[in-house]
């Protein structure tokens, strides 16, 4: 009984349960391939518990191994559109600090209109994740079609 | 030492480790786009620890943020079949209670024969998840090709 | 306070946080469809905390339910290449011990050049996971395009 009480009194943050699920806000200005994200219960089913948004990019607050996942659906798209506009590529990476810049996850659309994937990766406090969509096609802002999230898994 | 003993004595359920992985049982009757799921060790590698099945649909028993994942493969399918029968779309959503009805995850097959994705989403006790497959193509019942699951991540 | 101290003193391994993320090392020798994996911080962002590699295949060290995920991208590939070389299929399964041999996850490339999926599955200490790529196309060894991992979720 003592354990259960103690467990309830510990703030979740001390257990390292950082988690975020974001929805697309907008694409970047010209020559900026980044997608800009937003999150919060007022917006729907998106949320940030631990990580933060910095100008639409996700910043990590706790060191650890994270599961990073993403789905992006192109807005006005058929298999012929997708192949005609090829290559359309999505890359998720650490974009700052510059010393830790690296691509974590990369996918091309080819003849499809949706990409979805996930991976485990070590991230450090202060790492900012960017999602670059290169090509001429636009992403859907529907919250069930395009989303991006992270989940802290272990130290 | 006291902590370790206490931890072992606590039932797993009190840690909130609700998890389920389901295999396809059958498709719905005419005009019902829902897939009907089944789970349990006697069936293979599917299981329910916490959530329950209600007439083939998954019902959540614990509030929290969940990782929802799905893969659906079409049974008799080639890229030409898939494009000829387009649009074939899969949507995962909360279908009851009606007041919380919402689409969580949506994917189209386009020229592919498999879709797979995952996302984090808040779910509440009593939420029932439905998976709607619209189109004329049938899903494979092979357990390594078509499956649907949830994992409780945090309160 | 006693709880927090005790929690910090427990080795992570006792909490069952086994996790691994691997990068592609090489394809198999003659008539061997298996992909051979490697992991470790010296190689980049891959790691093994708990599971081990046995001749390039992933061996599980702790019983439990795991989230298994994979992404494989073909190296020289366009939608026309992929369809011309069809069927190219990836299967993840338990390959030893032979008594537990089973396919867990199967995907075909059809007209795409990347497959990505994930699933929950029970695994036991000593289970070895193999990833079989059948067909004539070659996988990319880029660490952001091809990776394979497992995460212990619960007992």
């Amino acid at each position: 009984q003592r354990f259960a009480q103690a467990q309830q009194q510990l703030p979740l943050e001390s257990l390292g349960w950082d988690v975020a699920e974001l929805q697309l806000n907008h694409t970047g200005p010209q020559q900026d391939p980044r997608l800009y994200w937003q999150g919060g219960p007022a917006l729907g089913r998106s949320f940030l518990h631990g990580p933060e948004l910095d100008k639409g990019q996700l910043r990590i607050h706790r060191d650890g191994i994270y599961m990073v996942h993403i789905q992006v659906t192109l807005a006005i798209c058929s298999s012929t559109t997708a192949s005609r506009h090829h290559p359309t590529t999505l890359a998720v990476g650490i974009c700052s600090p510059a010393s830790r810049s690296i691509s974590l996850l990369r996918l091309s659309f080819h003849q499809g209109c949706t990409i979805a994937s996930q991976r485990l990766t070590p991230l450090a406090r202060g790492d900012t994740l960017c999602t670059n969509l290169t090509g001429t096609l636009l992403p859907s802002r529907n919250t069930d079609e395009t989303f991006f999230g992270v989940q802290w898994v272990r130290p | 030492q006291r902590f370790a003993q206490a931890q072992q004595q606590l039932p797993l359920e009190s840690l909130g480790w609700d998890v389920a992985e389901l295999q396809l049982n059958h498709t719905g009757p005419q005009q019902d786009p829902r897939l009907y799921w089944q789970g349990g060790p006697a069936l293979g590698r599917s299981f329910l620890h916490g959530p329950e099945l209600d007439k083939g649909q998954l019902r959540i028993h614990r509030d929290g943020i969940y990782m929802v994942h799905i893969q659906v493969t079409l049974a008799i399918c080639s890229s030409t079949t898939a494009s000829r029968h387009h649009p074939t779309t899969l949507a995962v959503g909360i279908c009851s209670p009606a007041s919380r009805s919402i689409s969580l995850l949506r994917l189209s097959f386009h020229q592919g024969c498999t879709i797979a994705s995952q996302r984090l989403t808040p779910l509440a006790r009593g939420d029932t998840l439905c998976t709607n497959l619209t189109g004329t193509l049938l899903p494979s019942r092979n357990t390594d090709e078509t499956f649907f699951g949830v994992q409780w991540v945090r309160p | 306070q006693r709880f927090a101290q005790a929690q910090q003193q427990l080795p992570l391994e006792s909490l069952g946080w086994d996790v691994a993320e691997l990068q592609l090392n090489h394809t198999g020798p003659q008539q061997d469809p298996r992909l051979y994996w490697q992991g470790g911080p010296a190689l980049g962002r891959s790691f093994l905390h708990g599971p081990e590699l046995d001749k390039g295949q992933l061996r599980i060290h702790r019983d439990g339910i795991y989230m298994v995920h994979i992404q494989v991208t073909l190296a020289i590939c366009s939608s026309t290449t992929a369809s011309r070389h069809h069927p190219t299929t990836l299967a993840v399964g338990i390959c030893s011990p032979a008594s537990r041999s089973i396919s867990l996850l199967r995907l075909s490339f059809h007209q795409g050049c990347t497959i990505a999926s994930q699933r929950l599955t029970p695994l036991a200490r000593g289970d070895t996971l193999c990833t079989n790529l059948t067909g004539t196309l070659l996988p990319s060894r880029n660490t952001d395009e091809t990776f394979f991992g497992v995460q212990w979720v619960r007992p």
């Epitope: - | - | 394809t27 190296a75 990319s140």
Partner: nanobody, 125 residues
Framework: QVQLVESGGGLVQPGGSLRLSCAAS????????MGWYRQAPGKQRELVAA???????NYADSVKGRFTISRDNAKNTVYLQMNSLKPEDTAVYYC???????????????????WGQGTLVTVSS
């Protein structure tokens, strides 16, 4: 620039044998795989056999048991031993190489595909 030079084609009677060779030269970083494709008149180019740098081999169903692919890594050369040849094996045979160029830290691989000019194999009595 990488070049592939094929040799060994020619006219052979049904049931006979031929050995094709393909040598890669130029600024080769690493050959990931080499293989042979063929194209018969009015048909699409199809894979005959391929071999990876780890020794993995793949054969078209139509040539299994008759053709053998092998590779000499030191010479950057691939061979195709063709036995029990049939009239339907008549085609232009093309050598193919997939190059893997590694650069940077962390390593990033760039994949390139190179084709030979082709060598004609005619199986006829």
């Amino acid at each position: 620039q990488v070049q592939l030079v094929e040799s060994g084609g020619g006219l052979v009677q049904p049931g006979g044998s031929l050995r094709l060779s393909c040598a890669a030269s130029g600024s080769i970083f690493s050959i990931y795989a080499m293989g042979w494709y063929r194209q018969a008149p009015g048909k699409q180019r199809e894979l005959v056999a391929a071999i990876t740098n780890s020794g993995g081999t793949n054969y078209a169903d139509s040539v299994k048991g008759r053709f053998t692919i092998s590779r000499d890594n030191a010479k950057n050369t691939v061979y195709l031993q063709m036995n029990s040849l049939k009239p339907e094996d008549t085609a232009v045979y093309y050598c193919n190489a997939v190059l893997e160029q590694a650069s940077g830290d962390p390593v990033v691989y760039r994949y390139l595909e190179v084709w030979g000019q082709g060598t004609l194999v005619t199986v006829s009595s």
